[in-house]
């Protein structure tokens, strides 16, 4: 969380962003909230982004200006119109782009003032894993896949039952490139499977960690898929 | 840690050219818009020119307008200025800057270019 | 183009005294100027962006205020390195950018 004050001859209002991650190819949020003003005309919210000449977005009295919006941007961003009244200038970015990635502003001035806070937005692409057994293989064999993962992860298996195990000699793992040319397939395979045991698949990058889970018994398998985005700050 | 290093400066006679160049590292080149920025002997900054990061949009000042050529090369991590018809009034230190929030959050040491007969 | 008019142009201060230079856009420019200190030799240095955003590393005794046609950078207990000139610069929409003509801080 990143909490920013504004310092001028005007009075300082507070802003506050907060740290995350964009799915290149869906559509993402930056989040900024202020101390809300009585009358949307006199607020403005401008976004940037470090290092970009234009401007990523600009809302004012009531509604978008996007003349000085970067072409990087066009057609891209979007505030939360009905929220901005409330103190949310939460940006939508559509599509996101690997280039997306860096350090953007989010800059307020209302009637009680103006303020500031960063923000840090990471891109890649990152998804749930499925793990299911591998009837075709000879031996008890799980087969974890992801379909999408940006930049690549490591892989790790895990046992409830032989917890601190470790399974690199008994694991097999692939990153296949798919067509955009960006984002990779996961696939790991895990050889010599007890039954009567939960396993994990664990993926992460630095944007995100994600877990397949399985349970082989006799007479059933249970599964269970956990996403987490990492580094979610904010400031 | 960012670095920029310019190089190409050097004495030069009217109506002569040069080719500046400003190699950068230590951030991704290719996120940030670059920016030329002289000085005149005893004198003040004056802008000269920046570039997107793509390249794609060029702006100038009037005063080297349709003389000279701000260009970058991402994959080599390098600004360029390209300076024709080169006058008197050119004569200052160049320095290369990387835009952050519209200003100029790191700059190279310079070179200096100085324009006489 | 839009013009930056600096005041004064010299001003002569003890280690201690509150410094303040002012920068008057010749147009509306929003929160959109930033304050450079040079050193003889030296290239420009960041200290404040967005009219009052304080560079990372910059020291806390550099402010910046002013909104519009009107800047003010405030050196609270000036320094010995902070001996210097002091340049404004404006960065509304896109370039041509422009600087103001400069502040030199000298010791009296």
């Known amino acids: 969380l990143i909490i920013g004050f504004g310092i001028s001859g005007r009075h300082s209002i507070t802003v506050t962003t907060v740290a995350s991650a964009g799915n290149i190819g869906e559509d993402g949020i930056l989040s900024c909230t202020f101390e809300p003003d009585i009358k949307l005309s006199d607020i403005v919210i401008q976004w940037l982004k470090e290092g970009v000449l234009g401007l990523v977005h600009e809302f004012k009295e009531g509604k978008d200006e996007l003349s000085e919006q970067d072409e990087m941007f066009r057609g891209r961003t979007a505030v939360f119109a009905d929220q901005v009244i409330v103190g949310n200038a939460s940006l939508r970015l559509k599509n996101v782009q690997l280039t997306d990635a860096g350090t953007y502003k989010c800059y307020i001035i209302t009637s009680k003032g103006k303020g500031n806070a960063n923000l840090e937005y990471k891109t890649g692409a990152f998804s749930m894993p499925e793990v299911n057994v591998d009837y075709n293989a000879s031996s008890e064999t799980l087969r974890c896949e992801a379909p999408r993962w940006f930049p690549q992860p490591t892989v790790v298996w895990a046992s409830q039952v032989d917890q601190g195990a470790n399974f690199s000699e008994v694991s097999n793992t692939s990153f296949e490139l798919n067509s955009e040319n960006v984002t990779m397939k996961v696939v790991s395979v895990l050889y010599n499977v007890t039954i009567n045991n939960t396993y994990s698949c664990m993926i992460e990058n630095d944007i995100a960690k994600a877990t397949g889970d399985i349970k082989v018994t006799e007479s059933e398998i249970k599964r269970r898929s956990h996403l987490q985005l990492l580094n979610s700050k904010a400031s | 840690e960012v670095q920029l290093l310019e190089s190409g400066g050097g004495l030069v006679q009217p109506g002569g050219s040069l080719r500046l160049s400003c190699a950068a590292s230590?951030?991704?080149?290719?996120?940030?818009?670059m920016s030329w920025v002289r000085q005149a002997p005893g004198k003040g900054l004056e802008w000269v020119s920046a570039?997107?990061?793509?390249?794609?949009?060029?702006y100038y000042a009037d005063s080297v307008k349709g003389r000279f050529t701000i260009s970058r090369d991402n994959s080599k991590n390098t600004l360029y200025l390209q300076m024709n018809s080169l006058r008197a009034e050119d004569t200052a230190v160049y320095y290369c800057?990387?835009?952050?929030?519209?200003?100029?959050?790191?700059w190279g040491q310079g070179t200096t270019v100085t324009v006489s007969s | 183009d839009i013009q930056l008019t600096q005041s004064p142009s010299s001003v002569s201060a003890s280690v201690g005294d509150r410094v303040t230079i002012t920068c008057r856009a010749s147009?509306?420019?929003?929160?959109?100027l930033a304050w450079y200190q040079q050193k003889p030799g030296k290239a420009p240095k960041l200290l404040i962006y967005?009219?009052?955003s304080l560079q990372s590393g910059v020291p806390s005794r550099f402010s910046g205020s002013g909104s519009g046609t009107d800047f003010t950078l405030t050196i609270s207990s000036l320094q010995p390195e902070d001996f210097a000139t002091y340049y404004c610069?404006?960065?509304?929409?896109?370039?041509?950018?422009?600087f103001g003509g400069g502040t030199k801080v000298e010791i009296k």
């Open positions: 800057a990387r835009v952050g929030f519209r200003a100029l959050n790191y």
């Open positions: 230590g951030f991704t080149f290719s996120s940030y818009a």
């Open positions: 570039i997107s990061g793509s390249g794609g949009s060029t």
């Open positions: 147009q509306d420019i929003s929160s959109w």
């Open positions: 967005a009219a009052s």
């Open positions: 610069q404006q960065a509304t929409s896109y370039p041509p950018w422009t």
